[in-house]
Amino acid sequence: MMTGTIETTGNISAKKGGSVILQCHLSSTMAQVTQVNWEQHDHSLLAIRNAELGWHIYPAFKDRVAPGPGLGLTLQSLTMNDTGEYFCTYHTYPDGTYRGRIFLEVLESSVAEHSARFQIP
């Protein structure tokens, strides 16, 4: 019986060349997390965080992805091509899989600075 819920950072924007934290949090379940997978919009795996083996960052992303904080992921040196959906998949016993979605929009530097001025604190 899946009782848990995944909370994510939702829709986020960041500026080109900058960095962003992708964060998911699983709550309201007694289930034990054995692995968390991070995927990009085209279903390519960015990273896996395994309860025993720790982090594995896939070679294509080694230079631009840093593990953490926690079970999250930090994306660095953002390009316009990084715009799109990101998914965290929690493998849990005995509940099964929980999946969270984050949409990242990478903005040109000037646009990002402009939109930041109008963000509500």
């Epitope: 289930a31 034990q32 054995t34 692995q35 395994n50 025993e52 083996l53 493998h91 016993y93 005995p94």
Partner: antibody, heavy 122, light 106 residues
Framework: EVQLVQSGSELKKPGASVKVSCKAS????????MNWVRQAPGQGLEWMGW????????TYAQGFTGRFVFSLDTSVSTAYLQISSLKAEDTAVYYC???????????????WGQGTMVTVSS | DIQLTQSPSFLSASVGDRVTITCRAS??????LAWYQQKPGKAPKLLIY???TLQSGVPSRFSGSGSGTEFTLTISSLQPEDFATYYC????????FGGGTKVEIK
């Protein structure tokens, strides 16, 4: 070598309590959930429940609430099963079993303790 | 709870026989099924997980198939050490075991 080693056989009187230990070695204890399984003489396997080795939270299967308690001592990589107010029908072999596999597709009880025979008799 | 029904409960066979054991689930469990072998006085041993994946160190004469509600364990050529009781287990939700199949010498 990855293994689970359980405490020895117990002979108890009705109404007494028993505590069975299950010591893990050869792997990261807190990375894998731990289950308890009962097998009455000449019978099949019955899942009793499991304990989250990260948080210590136990979950009990139907029929195993009240008198049964799962606990942990992570400092010595050991899981425990305590049964109170023992009855004759608690006579069985009790196994601890680790959930192996990292993704849900690979989950199974890959490592088992050797079993602890608990006999309840007056 | 998901119920698992194993058939047959008892099976008499000879060395070299091909043996098939069936496990039916009361509802769909995808491929979240494992098979175990248990010999008298011993703990169960994992043979197959994810319905068809052979556990490391298990002889290739053992194979598993199926998905959804119907699963089979096949021993292609029964060996003397294979006489034992076999259990299926679902891990789609809280785990449950089938009633077991005892494979005896004919």
């Amino acid at each position: 070598e990855v293994q689970l080693v359980q405490s020895g056989s117990e002979l108890k009187k009705p109404g007494a309590s028993v505590k069975v230990s299950c010591k893990a070695s050869g792997y990261t204890f807190t990375a894998y959930p731990m289950n308890w399984v009962r097998q009455a003489p000449g019978q099949g396997l019955e899942w009793m429940g499991w304990i989250n080795t990260n948080t210590g939270n136990p979950t009990y299967a139907q029929g195993f609430t009240g008198r049964f308690v799962f606990s942990l001592d992570t400092s010595v990589s050991t899981a425990y099963l305590q049964i109170s107010s023992l009855k004759a029908e608690d006579t069985a072999v009790y196994y601890c079993a680790r959930v192996g596999g990292y993704s849900v597709y690979d989950y199974a009880f890959d490592i088992w303790g050797q079993g602890t025979m608990v006999t309840v008799s007056s | 709870d998901i119920q698992l029904t194993q058939s047959p409960s008892f099976l008499s066979a000879s060395v070299g026989d091909r043996v098939t054991i069936t496990c039916r689930a009361s509802q769909g469990i995808s491929s979240y099924l494992a098979w175990y072998q248990q010999k008298p006085g011993k703990a169960p041993k994992l043979l197959i997980y994810a319905a068809s994946t052979l556990q490391s160190g298990v002889p290739s004469r053992f194979s598993g198939s199926g998905s959804g509600t119907e699963f089979t364990l096949t021993i292609s050529s029964l060996q003397p050490e294979d006489f034992a009781t076999y259990y299926c287990q679902q891990l789609n939700s809280y785990p449950t075991f089938g009633g077991g199949t005892k494979v005896e010498i004919k």
